[in-house]
């Protein structure tokens, strides 16, 4: 049987095969893939833009940031409002104050401690 380089196509991940000679071929890869048969997903994480301790998770021609609990947003640069998430974060009439990367309690009537419980 006669070998035809692009039948069937050796290109994976959506790559397009082009015959370059009697027994040779070339794969044109979709964005995000590389290699002679487009077999490798390019790592998009080097020098990523995830901030505030966000962890980069590689995707196909993109990446996502997995943020620490106190941060959110595309690059972990939006502060999570813990006072909204935890309405009872401060005890004994204390007032919750949202801060970048966390929150604090303003205590009243002699109460103290992180959550005004002491």
């Amino acid at each position: 049987s006669l070998y035809v380089p692009c039948a069937p196509s050796p290109c994976v991940n959506g790559g397009t095969c082009r015959q370059t000679g009697d027994f040779t071929f070339e794969c044109n890869c979709l964005p995000g893939f590389e290699g002679s048969t487009c077999e490798r997903n390019i790592d998009d994480c080097p020098n990523h833009r995830c901030q505030n301790g966000g962890v980069c998770v590689d995707g196909v021609n993109t990446y996502n940031c997995r943020c620490p609990p106190q941060w959110t947003g595309q690059f972990c640069t939006e502060d999570v409002d813990e006072c909204l998430l935890q309405p009872n974060a401060c005890q004994n009439g204390g007032t919750c104050a949202n801060r970048n990367g966390g929150y604090g309690c303003v205590c009243v009537n002699g109460w103290s401690g992180d959550d005004c419980s002491e």
Partner: antibody, heavy 117, light 112 residues
Framework: EVQLVQSGAEVKKPGESLKISCKGS????????IHWVRQMPGKGPEWTGY????????KFNEKFKGQATISVDKSSTTAYLQWSSLKASDTAMYYC??????????WGQGTLVTVSS | DVLMTQTPVSLPVSLGGQVSISCRSS???????????LHWFLQKPGQSPQLLIY???NRFSGVPDRFSGSGSGTDFTLKISRVEPEDLGVYYC?????????FGGGTKVEIK
């Protein structure tokens, strides 16, 4: 309060070198990348590149690769944009910026660079 | 790179009037995380750009409620319901879904 304060305007001749600065304050400097954005006269802004203060790693827009370098001094919370040999086409306003709610939430006041013989 | 096209390029307005600015992207701005990273900025004469709206429709802190954003996919709109003198300047859209971040060409809002 997040503040980015840039160095003053510069007038240079083609072929000369230049280093402009952007000092960040009011936040944890190492936690955020610093971007540089170019705005040529009468045009819209263009993202040039950024630096990660913690590692010193940089990422550039392909269009600007090899034209300038970005560096950082963590001790003075300052980022720099530097050219070794300026061209007339480098004439522009250069802004540093920091991410926040979206991309480029906080901006410096800009540094006007004029390159003319 | 993603091409961001703004229309109109220039927009003469009457104070107190309504303004609508369009921004179209050359490809969908829906990120793999499900969000759409389309933002709006205003650059007043002689000033740095300032963030107005992030992720299509969220007003940044201190931005008046006369500014609103809408849209999806590749088609986005910024509306100003009652134009005030401090609203004059050049408005830019920006996408940060795809690398590199790209701005639109701008829409200049000026007095009629």
């Amino acid at each position: 309060e997040v503040q980015l304060v840039q160095s003053g305007a510069e007038v240079k001749k083609p072929g000369e070198s230049l280093k402009i600065s952007c000092k960040g304050s009011g936040y944890t400097f190492s936690n955020y990348v610093i971007h540089w954005v170019r705005q040529m006269p009468g045009k819209g802004p263009e993202w040039t590149g950024y630096i990660i203060p913690g590692s010193g790693g940089t990422k550039f827009n392909e269009k600007f690769k090899g034209q300038a370098t970005i560096s950082v001094d963590k001790s003075s919370t300052t980022a720099y944009l530097q050219w070794s040999s300026l061209k007339a086409s480098d004439t522009a306003m250069y802004y540093c910026a920091r991410d926040g709610a979206g991309s480029f939430t906080y901006w410096g006041q800009g540094t006007l660079v004029t390159v003319s013989s | 790179d993603v091409l961001m096209t703004q229309t109109p390029v220039s927009l003469p307005v009457s104070l107190g009037g309504q303004v609508s600015i369009s921004c179209r992207s050359s490809q969908s701005l829906v990120h793999s995380d499900g969000n759409t990273y389309l933002h709006w900025f205003l650059q007043k004469p002689g000033q740095s750009p300032q963030l107005l709206i992030y992720r299509i429709s969220n007003r940044f802190s201190g931005v008046p409620d006369r500014f609103s954003g809408s849209g999806s996919g590749t088609d986005f709109t910024l509306k100003i319901s009652r134009v005030e003198p401090e609203d004059l300047g050049v408005y830019y859209c920006l996408q940060s879904t795809h690398f590199p971040d790209t701005f639109g060409g701008g829409t200049k809002v000026e007095i009629k």
